[in-house]
């Protein structure tokens, strides 16, 4: 199979085509399928785009959508690292206000221990 190594979208691919980009990635990279209209092409990324996290699987690592409520970026399926605007990050989850005993740090939008 032609690997089209010169094509930048084939970077990190184990298998690549000029029409669909990567279809398999090198071991430590994450597969991401970019959809544009009715076309799609695969990419192999060192880190996943915002809103996705790196999911490791035996067949192929892939980027998976962050589905934590009101979360913008996450480290894993269950752990948010950045909340949507107007929400505060506390122990991997997003809250519209910090729990009792925690105060909001406005610069980072995180809840920290201490009185309000």
């Amino acid at each position: 199979r032609a690997s089209y190594v010169s094509n930048p979208i084939c970077k990190g691919c184990l298998s690549c085509s000029k029409d669909n980009g990567c279809s398999r990635c090198q071991q430590k990279l994450f597969f991401f399928l970019r959809r544009e209209g009715m076309r799609q092409y695969g990419e192999c990324l060192h880190s996943c785009p915002s809103g996705y996290y790196g999911h490791r699987a035996p067949d192929m690592n892939r980027c998976a959508r962050c589905r934590i409520e009101n979360c913008d970026s996450c480290f894993s399926k269950d752990f948010c690292t950045k909340c949507k605007v107007g929400f505060y990050l506390h122990r991997g989850r997003c809250f519209d206000e910090c729990p009792d005993g925690f105060a909001p740090l406005e610069e980072t939008m995180e809840c920290v221990e201490g009185c309000e």
Partner: antibody, heavy 125, light 107 residues
Framework: EVQLVESGGGLVKPGGSLRLSCAAS????????MSWVRQAPGKGLEWVSS???????YYPDSVKGRFTISRDNAKNSLYLQMNSLRAEDTAVYYC???????????????????WGQGTTVTVSS | DIVMTQSHKFMSTSVGDRVSITCKAS??????VAWYQQKPGQSPKLLIY???TRHTGVPDRFTNSGSGTDYTLTISSVQAEDLALYYC?????????FGGGTKLEIK
């Protein structure tokens, strides 16, 4: 618990129209893509249409221009308007969650993770 | 369109046996394959997506292996309740397409 309940099937003459509905519950309907899949008597599964959470619609060539998928997020409902019906459209029509062709998810929403019980459409003169 | 081929329309097995159902895509689908189970008189149920991830509540006797164009659903120890039709589907590019189905019969 995710529930999808289809309705609106029935007997219709070739060239006629029918509107199918799917009532969804047990999840945040507006956040998910939704799809219709059909199964002709004694046959396999065939994708009919999908609609993204944002309202973008997708169809295979076999129904393009005849079928229209739509959603009403306020009513947690999915619809399929079927016009110019043909004998080959006879099938059980299933409503399913997921299957958005416009967005990559990398998870269960790329497949169709929950299905309704189906509604039967018969096109015959 | 991507054609999904399930070469066996029927497979006969006994309770406790290991059975493998195969599916071949007409082009590389990058592990974007789902498997569905349809029991008689019921609607399909998702078993596996992205080639290897089991859906919520699916017993661990169901596994899938494969990459590129070839995928295999394996039931490690068949139970009587596994009597059903099994469909593969590619969720790589539209139109979404399904295999013709494999009917698992219990001896």
């Amino acid at each position: 618990e995710v529930q999808l309940v289809e309705s609106g099937g029935g007997l219709v003459k070739p060239g006629g129209s029918l509107r199918l509905s799917c009532a969804a519950s047990g999840f945040t309907f507006s956040s998910y893509a939704m799809s219709w899949v059909r199964q002709a008597p004694g046959k396999g599964l065939e994708w009919v249409s999908s609609i993204s959470s944002g309202g973008s619609t997708y169809y295979p060539d076999s129904v393009k221009g005849r079928f229209t998928i739509s959603r009403d997020n306020a009513k947690n409902s999915l619809y399929l308007q079927m016009n110019s019906l043909r004998a080959e459209d006879t099938a059980v029509y299933y409503c399913a969650r997921g299957g958005d062709p416009g967005v990559y998810n990398g998870d269960y929403e790329d497949a169709m993770d929950y299905w309704g019980q189906g509604t039967t459409v018969t096109v015959s003169s | 369109d991507i054609v999904m081929t399930q070469s066996h329309k029927f497979m006969s097995t006994s309770v406790g046996d290991r059975v493998s159902i195969t599916c071949k895509a007409s082009q590389d689908v990058s592990s974007a394959v789902a498997w569905y189970q349809q029991k008689p008189g019921q609607s399909p149920k998702l078993l596996i997506y992205w080639a290897s991830t089991r859906h919520t509540g699916v017993p661990d006797r169901f596994t899938n292996s494969g990459s590129g164009t070839d995928y295999t659903l394996t039931i490690s120890s068949v139970q009587a309740e596994d009597l059903a039709l099994y469909y593969c589907q590619q969720h790589y590019s539209t139109p979404w397409t399904f295999g013709g189905g494999t009917k698992l019969e219990i001896k």
